[in-house]
Amino acid sequence: EKLPKAPVITTPLETVDALVEEVATFMCAVESYPQPEISWTRNKILIKLFDTRYSIRENGQLLTILSVEDSDDGIYCCTANNGVGGAVESCGALQVKMKPKITRPPINVKIIEGLKAVLPCTTMGNPKPSVSWIKGDSALRENSRIAVLESGSLRIHNVQKEDAGQYRCVAKNSLGTAYSKLVKLEVEVFARILRAPESHNVTFGSFVTLRCTAIGMPVPTISWIENGNAVSSGSIQENVKDRVIDSRLQLFITKPGLYTCIATNKHGEKFSTAKAAATVSIAEWSKSQKESKGYCAQYRGEVCDAVLVKDSLVFFNTSYPDPEEAQELLIHTAWNELKAVSPLCRPAAEALLCNHLFQECSPGVLPTPMPICREYCLAVKELFCAKEWLAMEGKTHRGLYRSGMHFLPVPECSKLPSMHQDPTACTRLPYLDYKKENITTFPSITSSKPSVDIPNLPASTSSFAVSPAYSMT
């Protein structure tokens, strides 16, 4: 009868190299009595006997992996135990060898000139594949701008137009070579103006051609702006050749203007824009054409807010460095003066002053202030504020300064246009229209009969405006 014998592994496990989808076998020869139980582990995890990916034969001494996968890499151990002495173990590694495989191939890229481009090329393989790149038909050479990263991706700093082309990556190890598909790198270039339009000084009624040339990728579009708005007249001719667009704007000149050429192209969701401007001036302007002294805009001050028509345009006088602030300061000072006048006079005077300092404005090539109608000015002077006006006019020859209206920037009524001559040439005061029904009930406020009737006209719906462009007493 045989004597019991503890297990001894007579052929220790060795490192096994295997290709993916091939068979790999570990041999664990054991001598012992009685016959041992042999178990197998991979990375310390027990391999189950019924796992169909493995075949365990020869009483457990032979482990076969039927179709190797890259995830089978690891340390395999066999353990033999027959109850006599201790269990014994031997371990060996499985190294899965793999031909190169490109797991994340490059894709087509559009990139803006000057940016950084990265073309991916992630690979698998054992031994680890080396990655190189081909541009067109030639191997790509690395330089200070172009580098193949550890990951295999191609990085191009400060992309230039000449970097555009077809690229593919090549993964290579001792078992083989893999090639990616060809991909396209397109380099987009911001719109840039090559030739700006030139300024012209011409006579009235001349024809002028402004020329603007731009380059970019994609080819830019060119638009023209006249004094901040889209060009309303004139003909435009365009010619495109080799990424360059040439635009010519022909104009019939009846007024001076600032003409801007805007070149735009699109990069994905973003746009790039380049601009160049030229002035067209008219050699002989008449004096009257030069006389616009301001601009039209919304009144956004406080003092006249309740007096001026909502949302109306008023005239700002550019003889002041900051017209809006200067005129507001004037009215603010005037308003304080009005605290001293009678309740009859005050609202009428407020309406007069606000509509005189902030006159209704007609926008256009030459913004024009619309003065108060003479009749309304006289109504304030001779009816609503007769006492105050007399005091104010008398101050100069009496040498007296008394509270009332003597500091106020009031208009000289006689110099204002009459609404009977042209109702559209002057501004009405709605406050007075509203009050005219009650004028007969007002106490007598002057010794002589007033020289003016409150005008019997519908209240104006026009807006009131801003500009001390008229003489003030």
């Epitope: 039209c296 805009a297 919304q298 956004r300 001050g301 406080e302 949302d311 900051d322 602030e325 507001e328």
Partner: antibody
Framework: EVQLLESGGGLVQPGGSLRLSCAAS????????MSWVRQAPGKGLEWVSA????????YYKESVKGRFTISRDNSKNTLYLQMNSLRAEDTAVYYC??????????????WGQGTLVTVSS | QTVVTQEPSFSVSPGGTVTLTCGLS?????????PDWYQQTPGQAPRTLIY???SRHSGVPDRFSGSILGNKAALTITGAQADDESDYYC????????????FGGGTKLTVL
């Protein structure tokens, strides 16, 4: 040199109140309109309220009307924003800003560094 | 309710020119909206660049200019520099019903 220094921010529960102050120096305070502008974390600027140099009118963003009150003390060169019934969406950095002139709606030409208001339970 | 629209982002090359715009969801921007432009870098208070359409704030380089282009307000930066990379906000005076001041959502400008 124009200087605007906000204070009074902090953590407050929804429904609570805070009063922000803005101490101004380096200019004639009463000659300029003032505003409060806020900026929620990671968001853009949002105008909240304005007041002219005289303090005679006040203007508010619709969502804060009835809850916020802007005021100024020209003798103390100080702008205030009283915030009541605070909501989580009022959480922001609140900037005090000087207008370019006496009116309430001139350009904002000088800004404080801001004070953080957090409304959270 | 007045909604002011700006491009969310824009990029420009150093030395290049870029025009940022500011529009109204309903209607055109005019000089009566007194468009103002502000620059803000992360963690800083805003800085005024342009006020009332085209007036440059003191100390602002003349590379920055404002205008009305068509139905929008525009801020043009010529000869862009790396430190122009910021958020840009426009502010408009609005007078629909009651006086208001409304900021656009801002444009993130990247100088590449």
């Amino acid at each position: 040199e124009v200087q605007l220094l906000e204070s009074g921010g902090g953590l407050v529960q929804p429904g609570g109140s805070l009063r922000l102050s803005c101490a101004a120096s380096g200019f004639t305070f009463s000659d300029y309109g003032m505003s409060w502008v806020r900026q929620a974390p990671g968001k853009g600027l949002e105008w909240v309220s304005a007041i002219p140099g005289s303090g005679g009118s006040t203007y508010y963003k619709e969502s804060v009307k009835g809850r916020f009150t802007i005021s100024r003390d020209n003798s103390k060169n100080t702008l205030y924003l009283q915030m009541n019934s605070l909501r989580a969406e009022d959480t922001a950095v609140y900037y005090c800003a000087k207008r370019s002139g006496r009116i309430a709606f001139g350009a904002l030409d000088a800004w404080g560094q801001g004070t953080l208001v957090t409304v959270s339970s | 309710q007045t909604v002011v629209t700006q491009e969310p982002s824009f990029s420009v090359s150093p030395g290049g020119t870029v025009t940022l715009t500011c529009g109204l969801s309903s209607g055109s921007v005019t000089s009566s909206n007194y468009p103002d432009w502000y620059q803000q870098t992360p963690g800083q208070a805003p800085r005024t660049l342009i006020y009332s359409t085209d007036s440059r704030h003191s100390g602002v380089p003349d590379r920055f200019s404002g205008s009305i282009l068509g139905n929008k307000a525009a801020l043009t930066i010529t000869g862009a520099q790396a430190d122009d990379e910021s958020d840009y906000y426009c502010g408009l005076y609005s007078y629909s019903g009651s006086k208001n001041y409304v900021f656009g959502g801002g444009t993130k400008l990247t100088v590449l």
